[in-house]
């Protein structure tokens, strides 16, 4: 009979053990253990009838298809075998043990006592068959094993071979190298690799296999295991395998698919190919006259680009548009994207107009092309070029007029200062009861009219000022101070200021230039109590044109001493001869209290100490500060008066031969203008030169050379 055994261990004994076994007996024990185990069988006792080749009684150990051992007898002889200490090991998880006794036993035999147990199979050590062993790493455990792969590989669904993920390779560069995975090491098994070369339309891909080519093949069947196929549109090239690389392939297409397949076995090194894009050839190029093309090549193919540029002083001209460079490209159909442009000489065109200046052409025919030359000059004698610039400009390669010092900036024509169009006479009488000034004698003289329309009725007054540049008037701060204030200093609104220049007779303003104010700037420290820092500036809305009757006065050097005592200076104004009249009467056309024609007076500078003493002796809080100087005569008779305020006290500078504004009419004592021992007090302009330049937005050094010393 048969006994089925499924336990992981157990004991098998001959029938009747430990007594003698019966004759003519047959028992089979079928032992089955789980997969991943084998069965180990050994005998603790063995005593069977001996016979030649165990013909009589025996124990036979076998698997499904193989006899592992046959035992009989008591001890091993040449023809019979006992198990002794021997262990029987099944190759698999099944073992069959059969005991058989014949019909007669001459002696009494005790039989056998055997034990079995399931033992683990170390598949990692024992599997020699490539078809079953792990591709990379094998891991044994009791009852089984599993496989794993090196970094970058994936375990195939067969749980044994290692493949790679290589189906998503896109190549878009014009040249490149493609290899099998891990090249030159053996390529992975069970892999499907896909390589796409996708270039711009117009290119054609050329393939060239290089170095090693080693793909598993078969002697009879073409590439049944591993292979490369090349797909170009609907056409498939290949399969390719073996050790001989295919010849270079010209695909005639911009899009190529390379498929590489490997099965689950084999150790081959793979392949490497390089690809290169080829394109249509474009015709030879000739550079333009006065130009060049870069890069210069014998041949140009699709996508090659060429930069056309011109020699210095020439510009690329394409479709009537000037440019520095022009790029053309070889197209897929083998034609150039554009015709070669021409090189045209640079033209700086008509030079910019110079305010208060003129232009002369040094080159014949008034040429304005590259290397032509022009010369700017200022409208003399009213304007002079800043920094004594040459005024010479050359047409540059960039197409702009360039000066060695100023670059592309135009020169500046600065107003000449302190040079009246007619020279002042030596004999000069006072303003009060005074002498008429000839037109052009005091071309810097400005009449400042302030009409504050923000009050009802309007406030109206006037003063004088001195032109410093085409846009700036210098005057006294008290002229431009809002009059409705007690001690606070607030400038009048610029809308309420009108400046008249080139004015000679106030009855006839037609020949004069009148200008509105853009800015009114009082000295920040002006003191209404003592008139210290009595200086202000008016910026005109528009620069005034200079001419014989309108020219600036020069500013002095920065000197704290101011004008030297006893020096003679001139003051002009339309001041009042009768101080008891109102401004309304002055400005209304019917009266003659305002001098119709500009008056002027010659006055000596009074020593500072003398002037201070003369005012300190008076009742009232008079203060002659270091920012003031006095002028006039001890005996009186000649003086400035109301309406002359802010006017320039000018002294002739022998070094520069120019008139310089040293003072501004500021204030005088309580007695009437021109009284005995009542000196006129003037703002000392030389203390404020830096402040004036700062307000006008010009560095002093820019304008200093005007007064040559």
């Amino acid at each position: 009979h048969t006994v089925e055994l499924n336990n992981m261990f157990g004991q098998i004994q001959s029938p009747g053990y430990p007594d003698s076994y019966p004759s003519d007996s047959e028992v089979t024990w079928n032992i089955t253990v789980p997969d991943g185990f084998r069965i180990k069988l050994y005998f603790m006792h063995f005593n069977l009838e001996s016979s030649y080749l165990c013909e009589y009684d025996y124990v036979k150990v076998e698997t499904e298809d193989q006899v592992l051992a046959t035992f009989c007898g008591r001890e091993t002889t040449d023809t019979e075998q006992t198990p002794g200490q021997e262990v029987v090991l099944s190759p698999g998880s099944f073992m069959s043990i059969t005991f058989r006794s014949d019909f007669s036993n001459e002696e009494r035999f005790t039989g056998f006592d055997a034990h079995y147990m399931a033992v683990d199979v170390d598949e990692c050590k024992e599997r020699e068959d490539e078809e079953l062993s792990c591709d990379h790493y094998c891991h044994n455990y009791i009852g089984g094993y599993y496989c794993s792969c090196r970094f970058g590989y994936i375990l195939h669904t067969d749980n044994r071979t290692c493949r790679v993920e290589c189906s998503d390779n896109l190549f878009t560069q014009r040249t490149g190298v493609i290899t099998s995975p891990d090249f030159p090491n053996p390529y992975p098994k069970s892999s499907e690799c896909l390589y796409t070369i996708e270039l711009e339309e117009g290119f054609m891909v050329n393939l060239q296999f290089e170095d090693i080519f080693d793909i598993e093949d078969h002697p009879e069947v073409p590439c049944p295991y591993d292979y490369i196929k090349i797909k170009v549109g609907p056409k498939v090239l290949g399969p390719f395998c073996g050790e001989k690389a295919p010849e270079p392939i010209s695909t005639q297409s911009h899009s190529v698919l390379i498929l590489f397949h490997s099965d689950n076995s084999g150790e081959n090194r793979g392949w490497r190919l390089s690809y290169r894009a080829a394109g249509n050839e474009c015709p030879e190029l000739q550079p333009p006259v006065h130009g060049k093309i870069e890069p210069s090549q014998a041949k140009y193919f699709f996508k090659d680009q060429v930069l056309v540029s011109c020699d210095t002083g020439y510009k690329v001209l394409k479709d009537n548009v000037e440019m520095d460079t022009f790029q053309i490209e070889c197209l897929k159909d083998g034609t150039w994207s554009n015709k070669i442009p021409t090189c045209k000489i640079v033209d700086c065109r008509a030079p910019g107009e110079l305010e208060h200046g003129l232009i002369t052409f040094s080159t014949r025919n008034n040429l304005t092309t590259y290397k032509s030359e022009i010369k700017y000059s200022c409208q003399e004698p009213y304007y002079k070029m800043l920094n004594n610039n040459t005024g010479i400009y050359t047409c540059s390669a960039q197409g702009v007029w360039m000066n060695k010092v100023l670059g592309r900036s135009l020169p500046t024509c600065l107003p000449e200062c302190g040079q009246p169009s007619r020279s002042l006479p030596s004999l000069v009488k006072r303003i009060i009861g005074g002498r008429n000034a000839e037109p052009g004698l005091f071309p810097w003289q400005a009449l400042i009219v302030v009409e504050d329309t923000s009050r009802v009725p309007n406030d109206k007054w006037f003063g004088s000022g001195a032109l410093l540049s085409a846009s700036w008037i210098l005057t006294a701060a008290h002229v431009l101070r809002s009059q409705r204030r007690d001690t606070t200093v607030i400038p009048v609104s610029k809308e309420h200021v009108t400046v008249y220049l080139g004015l000679h007779d106030v009855r006839d303003k037609s020949g004069a230039v009148n200008s509105s104010a853009a800015r009114v700037v009082l000295h920040p420290d002006f003191n209404i109590q003592n008139y210290n820092h009595d200086i202000a500036l008016v910026q005109l809305q528009e620069p005034v044109p200079l001419g014989p009757h309108v020219m600036p006065v020069c500013l002095p050097r920065l000197e704290p001493e101011g004008p030297a005592p006893h020096m003679l200076g001139l003051v002009a104004g339309w001041g009042i001869s009768n101080p008891n009249v109102t401004v309304d009467e002055i400005i209304s056309s019917g009266t003659r209290t305002l001098s119709d024609v500009l008056q002027y007076v010659k006055l000596p500078v009074v020593p500072h100490a003398e002037c201070k003493t003369s005012y300190e002796s008076r009742s009232g809080n008079y203060s002659v500060t270091e920012n003031m100087f006095c002028a006039g005569y001890y005996e009186g008779g000649k003086d400035t008066c109301l309406g002359d305020s802010g006017g320039a006290f000018v002294i002739f500078d022998d070094l520069s031969q120019r008139w310089v504004v040293q003072g501004l009419v500021s204030w005088g004592g309580p007695e009437e203008c021109g009284s005995k021992q009542v000196y006129g007090v003037y703002t000392k302009v030389s203390n404020y030169v830096d402040w004036v330049w700062e307000q006008m937005g010009l560095p002093q050094s820019v304008v200093e050379p005007q007064v040559e010393r």
Partner: antibody, heavy 113, light 112 residues
């Protein structure tokens, strides 16, 4: 014609604020100063300050500097005077004046708890 | 600030008589640049807004009768009503126009 029209009478509690308006017509509003003057019942005139609508420039009497605020809306030719932290002694008729010559009809502000 | 003192506080006058009102300033109101005295006179009747009579100390506002005249300079100013009419009985204020502007305390002209 040229005139200044003020907003109506106001009754306020101590500590509150009042905003009086003054609408100008018939002249160039932006270019003339508008003054504010007040008169307590049976008392004289007291100058509060002034504003130039075009520029927004203001001058204040020191006594009112911290409590009075003048504003101008040039789109409607209207000037406003706001007086804050009202007390009973602020009860008065408030006038707007165009630089002395043209007076509004006055606005009575009563401050009472 | 400039203080203006008006006197008398009340002036009793018969119709047709001359009235002289005084206004004294704590500071000089004459501006030497504009040659103006910044002083104005106003008339106020009960329940009405003040009305400008005189500006620049002596210039009569348009529409003001000639019987009203202003004089003075510097610190002392006078408003004269040469022949009082019934409509002239009111309170009169002087005002100086240097910022901050100030008013006098007023003079009440009543029928005698």
């Amino acid at each position: 014609q040229v005139q200044l029209v003020q907003s109506g009478a106001e009754v306020k509690k101590p500590g509150a604020s009042v905003k009086v308006s003054c609408k100008a017509s018939g002249y160039t509003f932006t270019g003339k100063w508008i003054e504010w003057v007040r008169q307590a019942p049976g008392q004289g005139l007291e100058w509060i300050g002034e504003i130039l609508p075009g520029s927004g420039s203001t001058d204040y009497n020191e006594r009112f500097k911290d409590r009075a605020t003048f504003t101008a809306d040039t789109s409607t030719s209207t000037v406003y005077m706001e007086l804050s932290s009202l007390r009973s002694e602020d009860t008065a008729v408030y006038y707007c004046v165009r630089s002395e010559d043209l007076w509004g009809q006055g606005t009575l502000v009563t401050v009472s708890s | 600030e400039i203080v203006l003192t008006q006197s008398p506080a009340t002036l009793s006058v018969s119709p047709g008589e001359r009235a002289t009102l005084s206004c004294k300033s704590s500071q000089n109101l004459f501006n030497s640049r504009t040659r103006k005295n910044y002083l104005a006179w106003f008339q106020q009747k009960p329940g009405q807004s003040p009305r400008l009579l005189i500006y620049w100390a002596s210039t009569r506002e348009s529409g003001i009768p000639a019987r009203f005249s202003g004089s003075g300079s510097g610190t002392e100013f006078t408003l004269t009503i040469s022949s009082l009419q019934s409509e002239d009985f009111a309170v009169y204020y002087c005002k100086q126009s240097y910022i901050p502007f100030t008013f006098g305390g007023g003079t009440k002209v009543e029928i005698k």
